[in-house]
C-alpha cells in the first residue's frame, strides 16, 4: 500500500522504502522520501531535509508544497513539470533553501500556482523569464496571485555585475505575465530605488511590501496605475520626505493604507507639504508615531505636532560669503 497518510495525519515515507521501489515507476500517490504527506490536507512537506533537488515523485494531489530549509542551489527549467502535471499545486514555498539561481521556465506546467514564496534565498541569478516561462514579448498570463520575494538579495560579493533591483524587476515584468498579481512582497532586499516602470505594469496589485529596504526617495515612482492598492509598506527605509506629487497620488487611491514607520524624516522646509498632508489624511497607519531624525535640533519631534515655523532651511550663502 502507498505510504500516503490517512484522513487527518501526515505520513513520513521511510527512506528504505523509497529506495526499495526506486527502480519501478513511482506509485501515483506515493510520498517522496524525506517528506511528509497528507492527502486529506493536499499537503506535502519536505522541510529542513537538505534536499539538493525537487523530488521527482510528488503526489498528483498536492495543493500545498513546502520545500523550505533545503539546499536546492539551482531551480532548473521545468523543475516541477511532471506527467501527469501537478495540476492542483496552488501554493509553493521554497524559502530558505539556498537557491542562488532560478532559471527560465522554472515554474512552467503549474497551471494552478497562485502563491509562490522564494524568500530567504540568495538569488544571485534570477532569470528574467523565471515567472513568465518564455522570452516572448507577451507571454501567457501566469496564474500567480501572490509572489513573496523577501530577503532574496545575495551577499555583495556574490552579486552579478548588474543592478539587483534591475534583475528582480526584469523578472517581474517579462512578457507581462504577472498582470494578475495581487500581492508582491520585496522586503529586506537593500533596494536603493524602485525602477519607475515596475508599478505601472502590475495593475492588479493590492498589497505591496517594500519595507526594510534602503529607499531614499519616491520622486520618480508613480502609484497612479495601482488603482486598487490596499497596503503599501514602506517602513524601515531611508525616506527623508514625500513630495507633493507622491502625496497627491497616494491620496487619490481610495482603498490604500500606507505604512511609514521608522524612516529618517528630515524636518526642514521641504517637509512642510508632507506635514500638512499628514494632518489631513486618513491613509497613513500610525501617523502619530512618525518622528524627525534630522536636523539634530528636530530629532524625535512628532511630525504631526510641527507647524510651518518649525520647518526652516538654512539659507544657502552665495559663494563669495561662504567660508572654507
Amino acid at each position: 500500500s502507498s505510504p500516503t497518510s490517512s484522513a487527518s495525519s501526515f505520513s513520513s515515507s521511510a527512506p528504505f522504502l523509497a529506495s526499495a521501489v526506486s527502480a519501478q515507476p513511482p506509485l501515483p500517490d506515493q510520498c517522496p522520501a524525506l517528506c511528509e504527506c497528507s492527502e486529506a490536507a493536499r499537503t506535502v512537506k519536505c522541510v529542513n531535509r537538505n534536499l539538493t533537488e525537487v523530488p521527482t515523485d510528488l503526489p498528483a494531489y498536492v495543493r500545498n508544497l513546502f520545500l523550505t530549509g533545503n539546499q536546492l542551489a539551482v531551480l532548473p527549467a521545468g523543475a516541477f513539470a511532471r506527467r501527469p502535471p501537478l495540476a492542483e499545486l496552488a501554493a509553493l514555498n521554497l524559502s530558505g533553501s539556498r537557491l542562488d539561481e532560478v532559471r527560465a521556465g522554472a515554474f512552467e506546467h503549474l497551471p494552478s500556482l497562485r502563491q509562490l514564496d522564494l524568500s530567504h534565498n540568495p538569488l544571485a541569478d534570477l532569470s528574467p523569464f523565471a515567472f513568465s516561462g518564455s522570452n516572448a514579448s507577451v507571454s501567457a498570463p501566469s496564474p500567480l496571485v501572490e509572489l513573496i520575494l523577501n530577503h532574496i538579495v545575495p551577499p555583495e560579493d556574490e552579486r552579478q555585475n548588474r543592478s539587483f533591483e534591475g534583475m528582480v524587476v526584469a523578472a517581474l515584468l517579462a512578457g507581462r505575465a504577472l498582470q494578475g498579481l495581487r500581492r508582491l512582497e520585496l522586503a529586506s532586499n537593500h533596494f536603493l530605488y524602485l525602477p519607475r516602470d515596475v508599478l505601472a505594469q502590475l495593475p492588479s496589485l493590492r498589497h505591496l511590501d517594500l519595507s526594510n529596504n534602503s529607499l531614499v526617495s519616491l520622486t520618480y515612482v508613480s502609484f497612479r496605475n495601482l488603482t486598487h492598492l490596499e497596503s503599501l509598506h514602506l517602513e524601515d527605509n531611508a525616506l527623508k520626505v514625500l513630495h507633493n506629487g507622491t502625496l497627491a497620488e497616494l491620496q487619490g487611491l481610495p482603498h490604500i493604507r500606507v505604512f511609514l514607520d521608522n524612516n529618517p524624516w528630515v524636518c526642514d522646509c521641504h517637509m512642510a507639504d508632507m506635514v500638512t498632508w499628514l494632518k489631513e489624511t486618513e491613509v497613513v497607519q500610525g501617523k502619530d508615531r512618525l518622528t524627525c531624525a534630522y536636523p539634530e535640533k528636530m530629532r524625535n519631534r512628532v511630525l504631526l505636532e510641527l507647524n510651518s515655523a518649525d520647518l526652516d532651511c538654512d539659507p544657502i550663502l552665495p559663494p563669495s560669503l561662504q567660508t572654507s
Partner: antibody
C-alpha cells in the same frame, strides 16, 4: 476562492442592539477591507461602512455613524457589524463584502425589527 | 454624498440581445465605478470594477465603459442566466454610493 459566511437571521425589538458576524475563508487571497451594506425590503443597496482588518481603521457612512460599529477579529478572520438603537426602518438584509471594490459578498443576514 | 442615477430602472430583452444600462454620477468619480449583479436569494456578485476591468471568472459578454460622470454597462448577447438586478456603485469618494438598480427581465 474567497468565501464569506454570515450569521443567521435575527428578530429584535425597537431600541435593541444587533451584532452580525461574517467569517472569511480562502483567507490567503482575501482583501484587508471588509464592507457592510444594507438592503431594505424591495429597495436598493446602501453602504454602511468598512474596516481595514489589519489595523482596525474604519470609515462610516455619516447616516450610520454613531449607531453602527464595525470591528474585526484577525485571529478568527471574522468581521462584525453592530447596529444599536434599532428602529423599524432598520429591518433589512445586511451584507458583508470583502475587498476595496467589494469583490466577494456574503449571503446576507435578515434583521427584523418589530415590537 | 455623490448621487448615482441608474437608468432604466427596469428593462425587458430577448435572449441574444445586446443590453445596455447607464449610470450617471453627480460629480466626477474618475474611473472608480463598479457593476454588480444580484439574483434573488443569491450572493451579490461583482462583475466589473474600475469602469471596465472584468472581475475574475466573469464571462466576456459583460463589459463597461465611460469616465468622469457617465458610464455604461453592456451585455453583448443576453443569456437566460443573466436575468437579475444590476447595480452601479462609485468607490472614488467616501461614502460609497450605489445606483438604484436595473431589473432585467426576459421578453
Amino acid at each position: 476562492e474567497v468565501q464569506l459566511v454570515q450569521s443567521g437571521a435575527e428578530v429584535k425589538k425597537p431600541g435593541a442592539t444587533v451584532k452580525i458576524s461574517c467569517k472569511v475563508s480562502g483567507y490567503a487571497f482575501s482583501s484587508s477591507w471588509m464592507n457592510w451594506v444594507k438592503q431594505a425590503p424591495g429597495k436598493g443597496l446602501e453602504w454602511i461602512g468598512r474596516i481595514y482588518r489589519e489595523d482596525g481603521h474604519t470609515n462610516y457612512n455619516g447616516k450610520f455613524k454613531g449607531r453602527a460599529t464595525i470591528t474585526a477579529d484577525t485571529s478568527t478572520t471574522t468581521a462584525y457589524m453592530e447596529l444599536s438603537s434599532l428602529r423599524s426602518e432598520d429591518t433589512a438584509v445586511y451584507f458583508c463584502a470583502n475587498g476595496g471594490a467589494m469583490d466577494y459578498w456574503g449571503q446576507g443576514t435578515l434583521v427584523t425589527v418589530s415590537s | 454624498d455623490i448621487q448615482m442615477t441608474q437608468s432604466p430602472s427596469s428593462l425587458s430583452a430577448s435572449v441574444g440581445d445586446r443590453v445596455t444600462i447607464s449610470c450617471r454620477a453627480s460629480q466626477d468619480i474618475s474611473n472608480y465605478l463598479n457593476w454588480y449583479q444580484q439574483k434573488p436569494g443569491k450572493a451579490v456578485k461583482l462583475l466589473i470594477y474600475y469602469t471596465s476591468r472584468l472581475h475574475s471568472g466573469v464571462p466576456s459578454r459583460f463589459s463597461g465603459s465611460g469616465s468622469g460622470t457617465d458610464f455604461t454597462f453592456t451585455i453583448s448577447s443576453l443569456q437566460p442566466e443573466d436575468i437579475a438586478t444590476y447595480f452601479c456603485q462609485q468607490d472614488n469618494t467616501l461614502p460609497w454610493t450605489f445606483g438604484g438598480g436595473t431589473k432585467l427581465e426576459i421578453k
